[in-house]
Amino acid sequence: AELRCMCIKTTSGIHPKNIQSLEVIGKGTHCNQVEVIATLKDGRKICLDPDAPRIKKIVQKKLAGDESAD
């Protein structure tokens, strides 16, 4: 678990096809916000907006193992 928040700025402008994997970190003792961190296919990590409807949809599909999320 992270010992502090990792994300301050977030984006929702990401295409699901560019996402290799997703990590969803719930609120905890050390960070009072949900953080969604995507690892892109080029290896970079990026913070996604957990409240954006399209990100919620991507998260649901990715965690369900549906790689065709668009």
Epitope: L3, R4, M6, I8, K9, T10, N32, K45
Partner: antibody
Framework: QVQLVQSGAEVKKPGASVKVSCKAS????????IHWVRQAPGQGLEWMGN????????NYNEKFKSRVTMTRDTSTSTVYMELSSLRSEDTAVYYC???????????????????WGQGTLVTVSS | EIVLTQSPATLSLSPGERATLSCRAS??????LHWYQQKPGQAPRLLIY???RSVSGIPARFSGSGSGTDFTLTISSLEPEDFAVYYC?????????FGGGTKVEIK
């Protein structure tokens, strides 16, 4: 110019609350955490917590969790720290400070607080 | 919660001398250790961040080193304006913690 400007000194009675403001200008408000740090007379620095100007989510030092509330107003780039149930030991200078800048890319390499407000003296006395 | 221990508490030196300040963490904080200078009646000022990275506008005589749990701030040649209190601070994890400070005074 780039600055954090805090509200003026306050004198409060024990049991009361105080709300200190910190207005940011000259930089991208949403790229920096805003921290609150206090310093009792002749003592060291004590971290109270911080707030994300983006989400408004605040993280508090366990010591103050039941008494402190941090909020922000993005329209005026102002952050507020309210401390309730004041006691004499809360007499201190309260500073806001920024940490950043950060982008959309998470990192485990963190910046120090490179910009501080001028401080607000809060005196708690009956 | 991490504890940062600074030593010595007071350092008595003359202008032109070299100052070496120590900060020890109770557990590893990677390199997320920063150094601040504070003068009476003023807010702290960031000198060094992420152990050894320089801050714009800070004289080159200030340098930092270390990693993990042991860190050092070095002032290569003390100037009259360098006599102040120095704090280390970590933000590898929250709560952020500061050391108790080292006062550098004129001998």
């Amino acid at each position: 110019q780039v600055q954090l400007v805090q509200s003026g000194a306050e004198v409060k009675k024990p049991g009361a609350s105080v709300k200190v403001s910190c207005k940011a200008s000259g930089y991208e408000f949403t790229s920096y955490w805003i921290h609150w740090v206090r310093q009792a007379p002749g003592q060291g620095l004590e971290w109270m917590g911080n707030i994300s100007p983006n989400s408004g989510s605040a993280n508090y030092n366990e010591k103050f969790k039941s008494r402190v509330t941090m909020t922000r107003d993005t329209s005026t780039s102002t952050v507020y720290m309210e401390l309730s149930s004041l006691r004499s030991e809360d007499t201190a200078v309260y500073y806001c400070a920024r940490e950043g800048p950060y982008s959309y890319y998470p990192s485990r390499q963190y910046y120090g607080s490179d910009l501080w407000g001028q401080g607000t003296l809060v005196t708690v006395s009956s | 919660e991490i504890v940062l221990t600074q030593s010595p508490a007071t350092l008595s030196l003359s202008p032109g001398e070299r100052a070496t300040l120590s900060c020890r963490a109770s557990q590893s904080i990677s390199n997320n250790l920063h150094w601040y200078q504070q003068k009476p009646g003023q807010a702290p000022r960031l000198l060094i961040y992420y152990t050894s990275r320089s801050v714009s506008g800070i004289p080159a005589r200030f340098s930092g080193s270390g990693s993990g749990t042991d860190f050092t701030l070095t002032i290569s040649s003390l100037e009259p304006e360098d006599f102040a209190v120095y704090y280390c601070g970590q933000n590898n994890e929250w709560p952020e913690v500061f050391g108790g400070g080292t006062k550098v005074e004129i001998k």
